[in-house]
Amino acid sequence: FVRTKIDTTENLLNTEVHSSPVQRWSMQVPAEVSAAAGDAAVLPCTFTHPHRHYDGPLTAIWRAGEPYAGPQVFRCAAARGSELCQTALSLHGRFRLLGNPRRNDLSLRVERLALADDRRYFCRVEFAGDVHDRYESRHGVRLHVTAAPRIINISVLPGPAHAFRALCTTEGEPPPALAWSGPALGNGSAAVPSSGQGHGHLVTAELPALNHDGRYTCTAANSLGRSEASVYLFRFHGASAST
């Protein structure tokens, strides 16, 4: 038996006797893009669609975190027949479209990268007008941001039994190795990754007992560099510390 199907959204007039190919989109994105903090990165995304010579209104969207539901970081819209995709959203002004959606290219440039940008990004395109269709990549592209270590906090805090302890927190990617040095210390405590802070780039090391006055130095190192910071412990009246 013969079936004739007119499906406006799939823009298809199709006579089928048994089975027919499904009208499907396809998106091509790399698994990962790597770039250094402070630099720019390009997130490539190209697509194919089943609609011949689509010239109607379209919207290009990038979102972060998770497909279909993550927050949008970039959005632009092109009017019928136009090759100019007018930016409607660019988070912090750091995202801009490099590709031409009319030529099936949604590639995005991200400026002034920070470690917080290290996540997965998903491209999406929407057709409107005569053809009403859309597609979003499920896999997305992982943006891997690398950075030399930076010590973001070093402090001396009260500890048990009138003692003091020191904390050093650093960020970097790859996650830095931390070491303490100071009076009567060899190479100090092990670094403990922080619990649930930031995007997994924070590492904290604790020196549980500062037994001597003097200078205590925290050193952070990864394959991209090293950083150090110091605190000074002086005990007055047996109870307080100045740093």
Partner: antibody, heavy 118, light 112 residues
Framework: DVQLQESGPGLVKPSQSLSLTCTVT?????????WNWIRQFPGNKLEWMGY???????TYKPTLKSRISITRDTSKNQFFLQLNSVTTEDSATYYC???????????WGQGTTLTVTS | DVLMTQTPLSLPVSLGDHASISCRSS???????????LDWYLQKPGQSPKLLIY???NRFSGVPDRFSGSGSGTDFTLKISRVEAEDLGVYYC?????????FGGGTKLEIK
């Protein structure tokens, strides 16, 4: 979280029409995707019946085309299956499922059992 | 229609064993866009099917890495590297490259 829930009569007489409802929560059926009906016969054979897309267009299994209709109520975020002229061969567990762009069913209802008997 | 044929119908295993299920399509399910829309589902008694693998070899979110899919053209395989009790049930392959979409007849994974 996305949830789908089928509801229907349970029993239908031969030659009558069957109407099933799928209520979707946690996601708008007009936002994205295709919303499918799939049935499972006694003995476990699964059969895809058809879908309604976010846009409202439908695609049906050719052998069911003469008696199937899938529609929706966007205000209630529901979509429906109507199957006409049922026979005992239509006795099955009926599932609704969300199909994403890569042709996969990522969310299913728990199923509703339909028996066609006189 | 594209006929999906699964073998074996029943697969008795011991916990910790490897398991392999085959699925063959009656025509190629390579889509013209370069993708192959071949998925695997597991249905446990009294439950709806749950997605394991999509587009031949991609594990769905939350699916343990002991599940893997492979194949091309008309021949596809699902492998379970170390069977656990929670893996028991009926496995179905599914093609979404051609209308009508079609499922395999199912393979029951059960304890030996």
């Amino acid at each position: 979280d996305v949830q789908l829930q089928e509801s229907g009569p349970g029993l239908v007489k031969p030659s009558q029409s069957l109407s099933l409802t799928c209520t979707v929560t946690g996601y708008s059926i007009t936002s994205d995707f295709a919303w499918n009906w799939i049935r499972q016969f006694p003995g476990n054979k699964l059969e895809w019946m058809g879908y309604i897309r976010f846009s409202g267009s439908t695609t049906y299994k050719p052998t069911l085309k003469s008696r199937i209709s899938i529609t929706r109520d966007t205000s209630k975020n529901q979509f429906f299956l109507q199957l006409n002229s049922v026979t005992t061969e239509d006795s099955a567990t009926y599932y609704c499922a969300r199909e994403d762009y890569d042709g996969l069913f990522d969310y299913w209802g728990q199923g509703t059992t339909l028996t066609v008997t006189s | 229609d594209v006929l999906m044929t699964q073998t074996p119908l029943s697969l008795p295993v011991s916990l910790g064993d490897h398991a392999s299920i085959s699925c063959r399509s009656s025509q190629t399910i390579l889509h013209s866009n370069g993708n192959t829309y071949l998925d695997w589902y597991l249905q446990k008694p009294g439950q709806s099917p749950k997605l394991l693998i999509y587009k031949v070899s991609n594990r769905f979110s939350g699916v343990p890495d002991r599940f893997s899919g492979s194949g091309s053209g008309t021949d596809f395989t699902l492998k379970i590297s170390r069977v656990e009790a929670e893996d028991l049930g009926v496995y179905y392959c599914f093609q979404g490259s051609h209308v009508p979409y079609t499922f395999g007849g199912g393979t029951k994974l059960e304890i030996k």
